[in-house]
């Protein structure tokens, strides 16, 4: 595939990445799949500046990111190391709360109304953000 040099239509460029901000809601797995079909991934927050950029665009709305602990430890969808990476949890979070009555705990992370993170039930239909790196090779065939 060819290397992407600019962002697709309706995506926003920031620091060599492209971002797409949904205006509807999906469960985390469906949001994850949506981004993958766009040759992207749910947003992975690696710095204070990226956090600020994303929260500016989403506003005070619960929004999925590419962080989950469905298989035990917290993991970023692109393989970025969680333990050594940027974190911005709300106080007392993540708490894997079981009291919601929906079965199980809370395995998926989202931005809250103040930008900080919370873990929640992955089935909740929140907005989401896709991210793709400009420097990575696109899966699309090159134009002839």
């Amino acid at each position: 595939g060819s290397e992407r040099t600019c962002c697709p239509v309706n995506w926003v460029e920031h620091e060599r990445s492209c971002y797409w901000f949904s205006r509807s809601g999906k469960a985390w797995a469906d949001a994850d799949n949506y981004c993958r079909l766009e040759d992207a991934h749910l947003v992975v927050v690696t710095s204070w500046e990226e956090q600020k950029f994303v929260q500016h665009h989403i506003g005070p709305v619960n929004t999925w990111m590419g962080l989950h602990d469905q298989n035990g430890p917290w993991k970023w969808v692109d393989g970025t190391d969680y333990e050594t990476g940027f974190k911005n949890w709300r106080p007392e979070q993540p708490d894997d709360w079981y009291g919601h009555g929906l079965g199980g705990g809370e395995d998926c992370a989202h931005f809250t109304d103040d930008g900080r993170w919370n873990d929640d039930v992955c089935q909740r239909p929140y907005r989401w953000v896709c991210e793709t790196e400009l420097d990575k090779a696109s899966q699309e065939p090159p134009l002839l």
């Epitope: 204070w48 600020k52 929260q55 500016h56 974190k87 930008g115 900080r116």
Partner: antibody, heavy 119, light 107 residues
Framework: QVQLVESGGGVVQPGRSLRLSCAAS????????MHWVRQAPGKGLEWVAV????????YSADSVKGRFTISRDNSKNTLYLQMNSLRAEDTAVYYC????????????WGQGTLVTVSS | DIQMTQSPSSLSAFVGDRVTITCRAS??????LNWYQQKPGKAPNLMIY???SLHSGVPSRFSGSGSGTDFSLTISSLQPEDFATYYC?????????FGPGTKVDIK
């Protein structure tokens, strides 16, 4: 009401150390990021450092990196600034301030404590 | 580091005047621009955060605008208690740098 009270300032010789404290009350200290900001006599404001609500992350200005350490004790509702290898240019009023989530602005400030570095 | 500049560095105005102070960042800070008021011998007070949101208790004669690198603080009708020094601060990227300040005094 929100109250922040700094202490620990004074006159100190260059190269020596000092620890500032900021006692917080009137809000749930353990849920707020906190800042130190300083102001040299007759000069403008200079941001010094920020620490996450749980102490898990911290950032500081290049001018103090490796010399100053921001820390906190949530059980005592107290923020600290450990200042080592002090220089004359560190002479300033030091303010602690509460962080406003989302904007990272400082929404409440203490009255400040004066640090004078002089031989 | 992001550098912040303010203009003018000082201004004299009458009570009732409309006053505008500008602040420029050396790179894009999106909307993460805050304004503080400081009176002599006192701690600063937050006036406006994220460009245009008024902090609680701040009179509505204060307003902020801008985006990217250029921002402004406007006082629609200057009151005696508004004579002070005003600082802008970016909170997009650490270190959270301040502008050099604008002193507003009575003409």
């Amino acid at each position: 009401q929100v109250q922040l009270v700094e202490s620990g300032g004074g006159v100190v010789q260059p190269g020596r150390s000092l620890r500032l404290s900021c006692a917080a009350s009137g809000f749930t200290f353990s849920t707020y990021n906190m800042h130190w900001v300083r102001q040299a006599p007759g000069k403008g404001l200079e941001w010094v450092a920020v620490i996450w609500y749980d102490g898990s992350d911290r950032y500081s200005a290049d001018s103090v990196k490796g010399r100053f350490t921001i820390s906190r004790d949530n059980s005592k509702n107290t923020l600290y600034l450990q200042m080592n290898s002090l220089r004359a240019e560190d002479t300033a009023v030091y303010y602690c301030a509460r962080d406003r989530a989302y904007s990272s602005s400082s929404d409440f400030w203490g009255q400040g404590t004066l640090v004078t570095v002089s031989s | 580091d992001i550098q912040m500049t303010q203009s003018p560095s000082s201004l004299s105005a009458f009570v009732g005047d409309r006053v505008t102070i500008t602040c420029r960042a050396s790179q894009n800070i999106i909307s993460y621009l805050n304004w503080y008021q400081q009176k002599p011998g006192k701690a600063p007070n937050l006036m406006i955060y994220v460009t245009s949101s008024l902090h609680s208790g701040v009179p509505s004669r204060f307003s902020g605008s801008g985006s990217g690198t250029d921002f402004s603080l406007t006082i629609s009708s200057l009151q005696p208690e508004d004579f002070a020094t005003y600082y802008c601060q970016q909170s997009y990227s650490t270190p959270f740098t301040f502008g050099p300040g604008t002193k507003v005094d009575i003409k």
